[in-house]
């Protein structure tokens, strides 16, 4: 179930001055759905900088096969797991490893997905009659994200990676059938 | 938090037809499989067949071909049955419901009580 | 049609007890089979999926097990609000089959 490298494509993602990174999604461990939903703007953008290069926040593609129980799709689906740091680069830890992040009482900023796409795939199951098919939601783009103080760390997890058979949900379903939940809906499907 | 609304009861003359509704909240239909179940009253499961929403693919259980017809209207997020030629055997509860798979149903409308009489 | 028979259709236990309820499948479903909970005026509800993988949100006291033709879901620790009707499905041929299911009642 490990991730396959497909490309070393990174897109880099610049937030547009003007324009207010979000919070991240919340996360619903409901085996079907895992709906995301974007929170309301901070009132004013955190960073002295208005040096847009300094923000990094990349877009990696990745390639892997989705499996639910035994079976396995027949072709692997490609998606996009969201890398890098959101901030001033000179406020990020170098490679001395001087410096810090910035400051504690700030809003933390985080590349994270911001868009998914449900993707239809076929699954070949051993001595399996029947075609079988699921929806798997996948990444479709990464913004940076404002998580407050009172976001919990661990709604970052596995932010970007469909489990195989993530908990029942949603179209996405990978085998990890045990999650069903992390079907994760699509965002974008609203 | 994801809900299937579906009507309460249905009351119907034989010979004619019905349409009953399944409005999804909570997750849009097009990244999902929507199935109908039928439950005879006191009775087992049987699975009437499976929708696409999002390129109106369908598969039906042979039984119920030419007596079910199922679509979806994503616009509204919801998915239809309709049900064709009714008689006796066709009163029971509808069920709409829902996975990622084509395969496997994980959450459940509160099912339609479909009533053939004259 | 694959024809998916549950025996017993009705099972008596104690709370506390552990009980297994069984389907047998007329062919192979190669762990295709999902088991569902129906409690009394409410709608099924999914509790194992691929024979043994419980879905989210469901007690680990309800444990799925088989292959091939055989399967059974076992309920250790029994609960009163286990009180419901339980049913297997396959889903390894369309079209995707019933048990009659098993009523369990709470002595």
């Known amino acids: 179930q490990g991730w396959q490298a497909f490309k070393n494509d990174a897109t880099e993602i610049i937030p547009e001055l003007g324009e207010y990174p979000e919070p991240p999604p919340e996360l619903e461990n409901n085996k079907t759905m895992n709906r995301a939903e974007n929170g309301g703007r901070p009132p004013h953008h955190p960073f002295e900088t208005k040096d847009v290069s300094e923000y990094s926040c990349r877009e990696l593609h990745f390639t892997r096969y989705v499996t639910d129980g035994p079976c396995r799709s027949a072709k692997p689906v490609t998606e996009l797991v969201c890398s890098g740091q959101c901030g001033p680069a000179r406020l990020l830890p170098n490679a001395i490893g001087r410096g810090k992040w910035w400051r504690p009482s700030g809003p933390d900023f985080r590349c994270i997905p911001d868009r998914y796409r449900a993707q239809r795939v076929q699954l070949l199951c051993p001595g399996g009659e029947a075609p079988r098919a699921r929806k798997v939601r996948l990444v479709a783009s990464c913004k940076c994200k404002r998580l407050t103080r009172f976001h919990n760390q661990s709604e970052l997890k596995d932010f970007g990676t469909e489990a195989a058979r993530p908990q029942k949900g949603r179209k996405p379903r990978p085998r990890a059938r045990s999650a069903k939940a992390n079907q994760a809906e699509l965002e974008n499907a609203y | 938090e994801v809900q299937l609304q579906q009507s309460v009861a249905e009351l119907v003359r034989p010979g004619a037809s019905v349409k009953l509704s399944c409005t999804a909240s909570?997750?849009?239909?097009?990244?999902?499989?929507m199935h109908w179940v039928k439950q005879r009253p006191d009775q087992g499961l049987e699975w009437i067949g499976w929708?696409?929403?999002?390129?109106?693919?369908?598969e039906y259980a042979s039984k119920f071909q030419g007596k079910a017809t199922m679509t979806a209207d994503t616009s509204s997020n919801t998915a239809y049955l309709q049900l064709s030629s009714l008689t006796s055997e066709d009163t029971a509860v509808y069920y709409c419901t829902t996975g990622e798979s084509n395969y496997d149903f994980d959450f459940w409308g509160l099912g339609t009580t479909l009533t053939v009489s004259s | 049609d694959i024809v998916m028979t549950q025996s017993h259709k009705f099972m008596s236990t104690s709370v506390g007890d552990r009980v297994s309820i069984t389907c047998k499948a007329s062919q192979d479903v190669s762990t295709a089979v999902a088991w569902y909970q129906q409690k009394p005026g409410q709608s099924p509800k999914l509790l194992i999926y691929w024979a043994s993988t419980r879905h989210t949100g469901v007690p680990d006291r309800f444990t799925g097990s088989g292959s091939g033709t055989d399967y059974t879901l076992t309920i250790s620790d029994v609960q009163s609000e286990d009180l419901a009707d339980y049913f297997c499905?396959?889903?390894?041929?369309?079209?995707?089959?019933f048990g009659g299911g098993t009523k369990l009642e709470i002595k």
């Open positions: 909570g997750f849009n239909i097009k990244s999902t499989f």
């Open positions: 499905q396959q889903y390894s041929n369309y079209p995707w089959t």
């Open positions: 929708i696409d929403p999002e390129n109106g693919d369908t």
